[in-house]
């Protein structure tokens, strides 16, 4: 019996036309929501004038439905047993699951003003940009609607730059009508232990963002893993959101709608400094903000964001060093609310429930030539928002899964 089940699983998890896995892989049957909490700055003038601690108050959730679009350009390559595809991006606002509307306003860091002196460090260029910042009446902070902040707005300062640059700014701009990929993954036909593992991303086996092995694209996209998952296994996956591969370790066994699943969690040492976890040395790419690579819990992904000073962390700076969170007031990190986990059904390797939590931060530094920033006495890694992307197998699907997989094994 076990042999037959194993044979069936091996057949059904292959990513090719006609299998159970393929159908769910092309278009997930799970409803995925992305909740946003925006960090509303309470004392913008005090910070800009006196370099005070930044007082923030989170507002949310503002919920969008995401990952509802089917994969596109699906192409099987029988030669190397891979399948390539792109994942279209789309987000639909869900008013009933939100505390307000997309027109709600927030006081947040002025993304363009903060980024300008970081991207253009030359003093001559900064003097010129300062004129434009003043002319556009821009300052260190700005008031923007949720819709603008997430999906993009025409920046008044950038609009004055007489060079052909993008004048639209937004944390996720551009998002709708864009795609993630091309991904090329192993279909598992020749070797089931490689199924869904990414062979290349955007035509490359490495990211070109990090030195050494940190640049590798490891594992799957976390939607599924090769079958017969053991608790001792480290699940490796690549997340384009954070521009790196990461890993999860076994946390606990839980019951999900009658299906036994393994909860894998992102461990704190994935965000540790090289001092605590030497494996992370290649994720520390600059020495100043990181206090000579001793700070932890934030990841500088600027190289992946056209040089913009974007830092990724866990929400509320969970698992981050005190020096990172010290200049910010109003953060309350909480392991249960702010950690990322994957609930993986061990026989099939399918992720039946997940919660991906991350925070987007922008570095702002003192800049003598930029009037809006010249009173700052220290750099700040400013939280802009945090998100919780969740998906859970539907009741109907869960019943079907129990009948076809776990039920048969029992």
């Amino acid at each position: 019996g076990d042999m037959l089940i194993e044979k069936t699983i091996k057949r059904e998890v292959v990513l090719e036309e006609g299998t159970t896995a393929f159908k769910n892989w092309v278009k997930t049957g799970t409803t995925v929501y992305r909740q946003f909490w925006i960090f509303d700055v309470q004392n913008p003038d005090d910070v800009a004038k006196n370099s005070s601690k930044i007082k923030v108050k989170q507002r949310g959730p503002y919920t969008y439905r995401v990952r509802y679009l089917a994969k596109e350009n699906i192409t099987q390559d029988p030669e190397d047993h891979t399948v390539s595809f792109v994942q279209p991006n789309g987000a639909i606002f869900e008013p009933s699951l939100s505390v307000g509307t997309e027109d709600d306003n927030f006081t947040v860091l002025n993304l363009a003003v903060a980024a300008a002196p970081h991207i253009y460090q030359n003093s001559f260029v900064q003097v010129v940009l300062n004129s434009l910042i003043k002319k556009s009446k821009s300052s260190m902070f700005q008031t923007r609607s949720l819709k603008e902040l997430l999906w993009g707005y025409k920046d008044p300062f950038l609009s004055l730059v007489p060079y052909p640059i993008s004048t639209t700014v937004g944390v996720f701009y551009p998002y709708n009508d864009t795609v993630d990929g091309v991904y090329k993954v192993f279909n598992g036909k020749d070797n089931i232990s490689k199924v869904a593992i990414i062979e290349s991303y955007k035509g490359k086996r490495n990211l070109s963002y990090w030195p050494s092995y940190c640049d590798m694209i490891n594992g799957t996209d976390a939607a599924s893993f090769p079958p017969f998952v053991e608790k001792s296994r480290t699940l490796r996956f690549f997340s384009s959101d954070i521009c790196r591969s990461i890993y999860a370790v076994f946390g606990s066994e839980i019951d999900l709608k009658g299906i036994p699943v393994y909860r894998f969690v992102l461990p704190a040492n994935a965000f540790a400094s090289p001092l605590q976890n030497p494996d992370n040395h290649c994720f520390c790419t600059e020495k100043v903000i990181s206090n000579n690579c001793t700070s932890y819990g934030v990841l500088d992904i600027g190289k992946c964001k056209e040089g913009k000073p974007v830092y990724i962390s866990l929400p509320h700076f969970l698992h981050a060093s005190p020096d990172v969170s010290e200049p910010i007031e109003g953060l309350h990190p909480n392991e249960d609310e702010h950690r990322t986990y994957l609930d993986v059904e061990p026989i099939t390797g399918f992720t039946l429930q997940f919660a991906k939590r991350l925070q987007v931060n922008i570095l702002v530094k003192p800049a003598r030539k930029i009037e809006a920033l010249k009173n700052l006495k220290r750099p700040y890694i400013v939280p802009i928002l945090w998100l919780n992307e969740t998906g859970t197998i539907g009741d109907e699907k869960a019943e079907m899964f129990k009948t076809q997989v776990t039920g048969k094994i029992k």
Epitope: S123, V125, N130, S131, K369
Partner: antibody, heavy 118, light 104 residues
Framework: AVTLDESGGGLQTPGRALSLVCKAS????????MFWVRQAPGKGLEWVAG????????LYGAAVKGRATISRDNGQSTVRLQLNNLRAEDTGTYYC???????????WGHGTEVIVSS | ALTQPSSVSANPGETVKITCSGG???YGWYQQKSPGSAPVTVI????KRPSDIPSRFSGSASGSTATFTITGVQAEDEAVYYC???????????FGAGTTLTVL
């Protein structure tokens, strides 16, 4: 010692183009922004153009905008000013200058005289 | 453009102050002893003095106004002094019209 040597001046015809070159020595040229400044006979100083250290950013004074191009060759330690469609009012002494940072000149060339006349 | 007085005069040994306003960034002060001769930087970035410039020359800035000072003026300091900087427009750097210093 910091030296800036301009060349390329002389008598020019209106409507034609001229190319001035500044050869730098005595410092790490690729670390500095460079400017061209001119002075018409009997008048004050007028900023003409500027270029940042790696040549990616350029800026021009109102009087020459659209007619001037500033460029640099860090390998040769030279900065060039190309001025098209010359006018009588472009007559003057053109100085190459080094920016100490934030648009504040700390070294000047000896200048090259340009006369635009038919 | 930047605003500076058109002329100042002083006796040898006196202190001379020239102000310049209207700038948006660091100021420089440039000495030109005769028309057509190359300017010489006497102060850059508000208060920095090139190594070959005598210590009697100094500069300071507060807000959008810069002050250039010669403490103990000498006959050889007679020249036109230009202030230079940035006026906040997008048309590059600017200079004042020049201040003629006469040593009596």
């Amino acid at each position: 010692a910091v030296t800036l040597d301009e060349s390329g001046g002389g008598l020019q015809t209106p409507g034609r183009a001229l190319s001035l070159v500044c050869k730098a020595s005595g410092f790490t040229f690729s670390s500095y922004n460079m400017f061209w400044v001119r002075q018409a006979p009997g008048k004050g100083l007028e900023w003409v153009a500027g270029i940042d250290d790696d040549g990616s950013f350029t800026l021009y004074g109102a009087a020459v905008k659209g007619r001037a191009t500033i460029s640099r060759d860090n390998g040769q330690s030279t900065v060039r000013l190309q001025l098209n469609n010359l006018r009588a009012e472009d007559t003057g002494t053109y100085y190459c200058a080094r920016d100490s940072g934030a648009v504040s000149i700390d070294a000047w060339g000896h200048g090259t005289e340009v006369i635009v006349s038919s | 453009a930047l605003t500076q007085p058109s002329s100042v005069s002083a006796n040898p040994g006196e202190t001379v102050k020239i102000t310049c306003s209207g700038g948006d960034s660091d100021y420089g002060w440039y000495q030109q002893k005769s028309p057509g001769s190359a300017p010489v930087t006497v102060i850059y970035q508000n208060d920095k003095r090139p190594s070959d410039i005598p210590s009697r020359f100094s500069g300071s800035a507060s807000g959008s106004t810069a002050t250039f000072t010669i403490t103990g003026v000498q006959a050889e300091d007679e020249a036109v002094y230009y202030c230079g900087g940035w006026d906040g427009s997008y048309d590059g750097a600017v200079f004042g019209a020049g201040t003629t210093l006469t040593v009596l």
